[in-house]
């Protein structure tokens, strides 16, 4: 990028530069016509017959350098060939010399600084590449010369440029003074400011464009070269913030459109909102969950939104005394998650009708919550209690939902408690064909014993057909029609309203061999 300090092609008024000495044949300001057919201010000198060593000087106005360390001067000029000039003396030249003089203010006068090299600093002696020639009987031919010179290093506030003619016939058509600077550049979402190079190469720190953040690592920098070009060098640069994606050749960050999001800074583009979520504004880093849908704390920001599961289905119970086996089917709706678990709530109702949460005497295997399999075994049920179990399905977002958790209930009523086994059977009397038995009344927990059942069979006769039963409402019984001198095995069970209790231990009794012995009381 070039920044112009002076361009005579753009000047409309007289330039009024200073010439020295004030004599005939000096540089003269004239109107000229450029390539675009625009009138321009030019300076011409054509004193080809001057005395040797006599110089004509032309000095520009004071030019502030505006921070430039090196300034470039592009000269456009025409020059007549000495050979084409019949009256040109030996002092005719086809070159001229360019100088500059630095100062902190516009202090030069018609006589100062002295018109000579030192204090003026010589830039170059300029020779014409193209000379305007004229041969007798032919048209003149020639072209404009263009030469760019480099001034500097400059350190003061401004400078003058001076031209020294020592016998040329030439016109200075235009002078363009400029310095080179590295243009503002945006690369990899990093903006590097317009920079005037002060040295061969200058490091320049970059800053992130709007809605971008620095990438990890060293802060981005680029080198501005003296020729106004940025040195090619990879830039770590910046990346677009969450909710923004790179656009326009990585020069700006564009907000994610409605319905899209970008959760992290860095490369990558905005993505459509995941299932069950939406973004109603631009620049979303995360999509909001629809009503009734949630993300667990551990879910990534870009994860779909999920909902708690529906209730488990088809709870089946199998009661076995004080143990209960429950199993069920998975819910119809998992809520879109894999982390499904089950939990149970329990209430118990006493026979009298008062209900409360289940007591600590119940045990759940493998546990009452965080179940991953659809079953549980409950132990320690009390007889004649009604239990209500509510089976719920849970997942990672259940805790975020408000409102009741759906459940599948099951009611189980345990049997009342039957009388205990009858033991302590004793033979009160025996005969060859009968045995009289008695026993202690068992303590029935759920009401009185209604009756008893006696089961007996001859020892050794084990088949079902040999077993006989006898019911009695008293805590005694007489077994008749027995074999003489035979051994019998006897068991008794009691019945209450809850049903029959278990048979007690087998009791061994024997009938008499003959009747002469008579009835004989036996104590077991």
């Amino acid at each position: 990028l070039e920044e112009t300090l002076l361009n005579t092609k753009l000047e409309t008024a007289d330039l009024k530069w200073v010439t020295f000495p004030q004599v005939d044949g000096q540089w003269e300001e004239l109107s000229g016509l450029d390539e675009e057919q625009h009138s321009v201010r030019t300076y011409e000198v054509c004193d080809v017959q001057r005395a040797p060593g006599q110089a004509h000087w032309l000095r520009t106005g004071w030019v502030p350098r505006r921070g430039a360390v090196h300034v470039y001067a592009t000269l456009r000029f025409t020059m007549l060939e000495c050979l084409s000039l019949p009256r040109a003396g030996r002092s005719c030249k086809e070159t001229f010399t360019v100088f500059y003089y630095e100062s902190d203010a516009d202090t030069a006068t018609a006589l100062t600084p002295a018109w000579m090299e030192n204090p003026y600093i010589k830039v170059d002696t300029v020779a014409a590449e193209h000379l305007t020639r004229k041969r007798p009987g032919a048209e003149a031919t020639g072209k404009v010369n263009v030469k760019t010179l480099r001034l500097g290093p400059l350190s003061k506030a401004g400078f003058y440029l001076a031209f020294q003619d020592q016998g040329a016939c030439m016109a200075l058509l235009s002078l363009h003074l400029f310095y080179k600077k590295c243009a503002q550049l945006t690369v990899n979402l990093t903006r590097f400011p317009e920079t005037v190079p002060r040295e061969l190469v200058v490091p320049v720190a970059g800053s992130c464009v709007v809605d971008a953040v620095p990438a990890p690592g060293p802060s981005p920098s680029l080198y501005c070269r003296e020729d106004g070009q940025w040195a090619e060098q990879p830039v770590t640069g910046c990346s677009c913030a969450p909710g923004f994606e790179a656009a326009e050749g990585n020069t700006k960050c564009r907000a994610c459109a409605q319905g899209t999001f970008k959760p992290l800074s860095g490369e990558g583009s905005c993505q459509p909102c995941p299932a069950n979520s939406h973004s109603n504004t631009i620049g979303s880093a995360v999509c909001q969950c629809r009503v009734g849908y949630f993300r667990a704390r551990t879910d990534p920001r870009g994860a779909p939104c999920t909902t708690p599961p529906s209730a488990p289905r088809s709870v089946v119970s199998r009661l076995n005394g004080s143990s209960l086996h429950l199993e069920w089917s998975a819910p119809l709706e998992s809520g879109g998650r894999e982390d499904l678990t089950y939990a149970l709530r329990c209430r118990e109702c006493r026979p009298g009708g008062s209900c409360a949460p289940c007591g600590g005497d119940l045990t759940f295997d493998p546990g009452p919550r965080d179940l991953v399999e659809p079953w549980v075994v409950v132990r320690g049920l009390r007889p004649d209690f009604t239990y209500t179990f509510e089976v719920t399905a849970l997942n990672g977002v259940s805790s975020l939902a408000t409102g009741p958790v759906p459940f599948e209930p099951v009611n189980v009523t345990t049997d009342r408690e039957v009388p205990p086994a009858v033991s302590d059977i004793r033979v009160t009397r025996s005969s060859p064909s009968s045995l009289s038995l008695a026993w202690a009344v068992p303590r029935a927990p759920s009401g009185a014993v209604l009756d008893y059942e006696v089961k007996y069979h001859e020892k050794g006769a084990e088949g079902p057909s040999s077993v006989r039963f006898l019911k009695t409402s008293e805590n005694r019984a007489e077994l008749r029609g027995l074999k003489r001198g035979a051994s019998y095995l006897v068991q008794v069970r009691a019945r209450s309203e809850a049903g029959y209790g278990p048979f007690g231990q087998e009791h061994h009794s024997q009938t008499q061999l003959d009747e002469s012995e008579g009835w004989r009381e036996q104590l077991a």
């Epitope: 003269e28 016509l33 084409s84 000039l85 048209e139």
Partner: antibody, heavy 126, light 108 residues
Framework: QVELVQSGAEVKKPGSSVKVSCKAS????????ISWVRQAPGQGLEWMGR????????NYAQKFQGRVTITADESTSTAYMELSSLRSEDTAVYYC???????????????????WGQGTLVTVSS | DIQMTQSPSSLSASVGDRVTITCRAS??????LNWYQQKPGKAPKLLIY???ILQSGVPSRFSGSGSGTDFTLTISSLQPEDFATYYC??????????FGQGTKVEIK
């Protein structure tokens, strides 16, 4: 503004010669083109010839070739037009005119004449 | 030498009229064509050079166009001071020049 000042009116005999001068006041002279144009009474403009003083040589219209000589003196910034073998039809106002731009200061060879002398009446009469 | 033919040789027009004068060269002159205005008893005045470039100080109602052999001078809205004779001229620095025969613009 440069001024071109021409010499005074002349009355000449047929067959004689006339030399008209044109002095440019101030500034560059050598690299401009100086043309001579004449205008007979009630007639149009007629270009006679041109000189670029720095080159020393002149161009002439075919019609005047051999009869007209255009010269320039750089030291006095004066151009001259001499017409010989005068005839009555050479009676006219003779103008000198300077080009708008020097040969060095125009990118194109446009040679328009924007500075004119006041004119010199030359009468050829026996 | 190159011949320049101007037309019309004269025309009558009123103030405010649009006036067009043409000039034809006998061979290609690129755009080395100038237009001059001359009033009686005065030296000619340059109006346009390079076929279309308006000389400094000349009103913008004057315009020129053309290249090669055919050229036009246009006065967009004729003013009282524009009644004069107009000449075209082919002219570069190095070859012989010629004028057209002139066009006299008179008041209608």
């Amino acid at each position: 503004q440069v001024e071109l000042v021409q010499s005074g009116a002349e009355v000449k005999k047929p067959g004689s010669s006339v030399k008209v001068s044109c002095k440019a006041s101030g500034g560059t002279f050598s690299t401009y083109a100086i043309s001579w144009v004449r205008q007979a009474p009630g007639q149009g403009l007629e270009w006679m010839g041109r000189i670029i003083p720095i080159f020393g040589t002149a161009n002439y219209a075919q019609k005047f070739q051999g009869r007209v000589t255009i010269t320039a003196d750089e030291s006095t910034s004066t151009a001259y037009m001499e017409l010989s073998s005068l005839r009555s039809e050479d009676t006219a106002v003779y103008y000198c005119a300077r080009s708008s731009y020097t040969i060095l200061t125009t990118y194109y060879n446009y040679n328009a004449m924007d500075n004119w002398g006041q004119g010199t009446l030359v009468t050829v009469s026996s | 030498d190159i011949q320049m033919t101007q037309s019309p040789s004269s025309l009558s027009a009123s103030v405010g009229d649009r006036v067009t004068i043409t000039c034809r060269a006998s061979q290609n002159i690129n755009n080395f064509l100038n237009w001059y205005q001359q009033k009686p008893g005065k030296a000619p005045k340059l109006l346009i050079y390079g076929s279309s470039i308006l000389q400094s100080g000349v009103p913008s109602r004057f315009s020129g166009s053309g290249s090669g052999t055919d050229f036009t001078l246009t006065i967009s809205s004729l003013q009282p001071e524009d009644f004069a004779t107009y000449y075209c001229q082919q002219n570069d620095f190095y070859s012989p020049s010629t004028f057209g025969q002139g066009t006299k613009v008179e008041i209608k």
